[in-house]
């Protein structure tokens, strides 16, 4: 019988304790928000917000500029000064709640927890390959704003998500804020609103459309806005909220809210419940039918998918898919099964389900007893009636009112439970060649870069490494700059190549040469490395 090389177990062919050092920036405080800008002329920047300060970094993560955003009432606050002589509100620290780009101007918009949640607009001024911020403009007109009607009150101290959409020659801010009774009473930022930036950058247009949790539900019904994004003709918000207005408020589930990105109005506001489950291949006795529910979304990202995953999801390559990391409860604590699961929801399918739900509500024959839902936003009603009305009047349309779609969209864990004890806290998905890669940050400060495929019983790692020695959780929001992703952990921002930090964690030549082409790995004497690390012979074709 022929002698064969003993097979190296797959897990033994890599070492995830290998140290990788990636470029980083120490922000001087817990990173609260981060956004990147890439201009057409090779200029780029990273904007990093911490309490009372906004940093501008160059593409090399070196500091270019720093701006004091608080405390409110402090003479050193540079943004506050843009609003003219104060006082403008109670003194206090500014925690950045919103940091977004208006690409048309181009400008950075920052909104904080102080000064009624107002925003500041910072025009971007390219200087070589770096970018500077012009003097801030205060997006607040005192005479237009009252506690009960405040178009310029955008950010909630409890959390706000914003997506900026260009329509014609104007910018619309799609805003979603978490509320409670105290926040709602003090210059209420509203739950969901669409606001239009005024042409003179003095604030937002006075007439804006909004939905808000009704006063009677504010104490018991809180909505957390986890993520927002714009793709195609719609803006989407992802929420974690109580499953029912009347039942136990700790029984949470995840919803997707859809708003039109082409018509800045809320008549076609729709919600759909997203259901993510872990369904092990061999079901244990007593395990729930259809799999164990993971109802609470932790992080999400949408991206076009590569060929292989597209085939597995029965969609076309390049189609947009929403990926979500789900946990069993708010604390994300251990239960039976993995700590985190990842589900994939193709956007076209989401839209189809929503449209079918509208048909069920509005096209006769309407199923008796079908509710319009969203009773926390509007008066209860049955389809096809508008909220709070017993019947449709001739000049109203069933479709012109918000609706919770009666069915949910159910998916199972793409990783088949293989994330195990890992608690995922950040997610960004990219397509590299025809491969779809999930870049995940974890509770213990690691980065996992894993191919998204569902057909395997092991994880295909691009990398799995520790960002530093602090072991602090990687924060939810991830930004992309060129071929790098920016992750925040504690007071640090880290720049991670999307192709992975290197190849040294592959221990055998065979494993090294089987690495994805985009990683650029080759065998280099006795280690796996990239060509730039290899002064001697570097081999991508065969093993010695």
């Amino acid at each position: 019988e022929d002698w064969q090389c003993p097979r190296t177990p797959y897990a033994a062919s890599r070492d995830f304790d290998v140290k990788y050092v990636v470029p980083s920036f120490s922000a001087g405080g817990l990173v609260q928000a981060m956004v990147t800008y890439e201009g057409d002329r090779n200029e780029s920047a990273v904007f990093v917000a911490i309490r009372n300060r906004l940093h501008v970094l160059g593409p090399d993560l070196k500091s270019v500029q720093s701006l004091a955003t608080g405390p409110a009432g402090d003479p050193g606050c540079q943004t506050c000064a843009a609003c003219g002589p104060g006082p403008h509100g109670p003194p206090g620290d500014t925690d950045t709640k919103v940091l977004v780009l208006d690409p048309a101007l181009p400008a950075l918009v920052s909104c904080g927890s102080s000064l009624q949640g107002r925003c500041f607009l910072h025009d971007l001024e390219p200087q070589g390959t770096a970018v500077h911020l012009a003097a801030p403009a205060c997006l607040f007109s005192a005479h237009h704003n009252r506690p009960d009607d405040c178009p310029d009150c955008v950010a909630s101290p409890l959390g706000t998500r914003v997506t900026v959409v260009e329509q014609g020659q104007a910018s619309y801010f799609y805003v979603a804020s978490s509320l409670d009774a105290a926040v709602a009473a003090s210059f209420s930022p509203r739950s969901v609103s669409i606001r239009r930036l005024k042409a003179d950058a003095s604030g937002f247009a006075p007439g804006f459309v909004a939905l808000s949790v009704l006063p009677k539900h504010l104490v018991s019904y809180s909505i957390e806005y986890v993520h927002s994004f714009h793709t195609g003709a719609f803006v989407y918000f992802l929420t974690v909220q109580p499953a029912s207005v009347t039942d136990d408020p700790s029984a949470l589930h995840t919803r997707l809210a859809r708003l039109s990105a082409t018509e800045p109005e809320l008549g076609d506001y729709r919600e759909l419940v997203l259901d993510c489950r872990f369904a092990p291949k061999r079901r244990r006795r007593g395990a729930p039918e259809g799999g164990q529910p993971y109802p609470v979304l932790r992080v999400a990202h949408s991206a076009p998918v590569g060929a292989q995953l597209a085939t597995e999801l029965s969609i076309a390559e390049g189609q947009e898919v929403l990926f979500g990391v789900f946990v069993t409860g708010k604390d994300g604590g251990p239960g039976v099964g993995p700590n985190s699961v990842v589900c994939a929801f193709p956007i076209d399918l989401l839209d189809t389900l929503i449209d079918e739900g509208v048909e069920r509500c509005c096209e006769s024959p309407v199923h008796p007893g079908l509710r319009r839902g969203l009773d926390f936003f509007q008066s209860p009603s049955f389809c096809p009636n508008p909220p709070g009305l017993e019947a449709l009047s001739p000049n109203t349309s069933c479709r012109h009112f918000p609706l919770l779609v009666s069915s949910s969209f159910s998916r199972v864990d793409l990783f088949n439970g293989l994330l195990g004890p890992v608690q995922v806290t950040a997610l960004y998905v990219t397509r590299l060649d025809n491969v779809t890669v999930a870049h995940m940050g974890t509770m213990d400060g690691r980065i996992l870069q894993v191919e998204l495929v569902r057909s395997l019983n092991y994880l295909l790692y691009v990398s799995n490494f520790s960002l530093g020695d602090s072991g602090q959780p990687v924060q939810r929001d991830v930004s992309r700059l060129g071929d790098h992703l920016l992750f925040a952990s504690g007071d640090q921002v880290f720049q991670v190549p999307i192709q992975g930090p290197g190849c040294r964690h592959f221990l055998t030549c065979g494993r090294c040469l089987r690495a994805w082409h985009f990683m650029g790995c080759g065998w280099c004497g006795n280690m796996c490395g990239q060509q730039k690390e290899c002064p001697g012979s570097w081999q991508q074709d065969h093993c010695p």
Partner: antibody
Framework: EVQLQESGPSLVKPSQTLSLTCSVT????????WNWIRKFPGNKLEYMGY???????YYNPSLKSRISITRDTSKNHYYLQLISVTAEDTATYYC???????????WGQGTSVTVSS | DIVLTQSPASLAVSLGQRATISCRAS??????????MNWFQQKPGQPPKLLIY???NQGSGVPARFSGSGSGTDFSLNIHPVEEDDTAMYFC?????????FGGGTKLEIK
């Protein structure tokens, strides 16, 4: 100081293509919106279309099948092409910048184009 | 398309007096609490100049003598006191709906 300058032929034959260039100084065409407007001999102004900071275009539907607006960011120029011109396209053509809501705050001096054989 | 009708077509006003030019839109040009009406001045041999945007906001470097007002469908441009240099054509422009459209113009002469 932002300045725009139109250039191109002053005489175009019917059925041919009118091609104009707008050269921009003092601002980058990678921010804001860059418009074309024309004024007919009887003083009537017509909005033609724009190219945005990102290269996105909008065309007046009355011209949609005939108009194209492009740009060259390396030169900071943007361009107008109008195909199959007739005598009705005789006008003064202006390029103009807007930051918001078609409020065009900087204009070129205009270039007069006559369509005639 | 929204049609803008300017009146009068021409206007002669004495030096130092008030000139009022009206612009009526075929449909409401307000949205989000803003009136999407701009006003331009054009002198012979020159390009148009932005005077007023969003119905009542003065363009950069525009003298305070120029003011705009109105909402819905009815708008006006006021010049007070008029100066000799104000001899020009004045155009209104709506930007609520695409395509943006212009009024037919009003010719102002100073007596």
């Amino acid at each position: 100081e932002v300045q725009l300058q139109e250039s191109g032929p002053s005489l175009v034959k019917p059925s041919q293509t009118l091609s104009l260039t707008c050269s921009v100084t003092g601002d980058s065409i990678t921010s804001g919106y860059w418009n074309w407007i024309r004024k007919f001999p009887g003083n009537k102004l017509e909005y033609m279309g724009y190219i945005s900071y990102s290269g996105k275009t909008y065309y007046n539907p009355s011209l949609k099948s005939r108009i194209s607006i492009t740009r060259d960011t390396s030169k900071n120029h943007y361009y107008l092409q109008l195909i199959s011109v007739t005598a009705e396209d005789t006008a003064t053509y202006y390029c103009a910048r807007s930051k918001y809501d078609y409020a065009m705050d900087y204009w070129g001096q205009g270039t007069s184009v006559t369509v005639s054989s | 398309d929204i049609v803008l009708t300017q009146s009068p077509a021409s206007l002669a006003v004495s030096l130092g007096q008030r000139a009022t030019i009206s612009c009526r839109a075929s449909e409401i040009v307000d949205n989000f609490g803003i009136s999407f009406m701009n006003w331009f001045q054009q002198k012979p041999g020159q390009p148009p100049k932005l005077l007023i945007y969003a119905a009542s906001n003065q363009g950069s470097g525009v003298p305070a003598r120029f003011s705009g007002s109105g909402s819905g469908t009815d708008f006006s441009l006021n010049i007070h006191p008029v100066e000799e240099d104000d001899t020009a054509m004045y155009f209104c422009q709506q930007s609520k709906e695409v395509p943006p459209t212009f009024g037919g113009g009003t010719k102002l002469e100073i007596k």
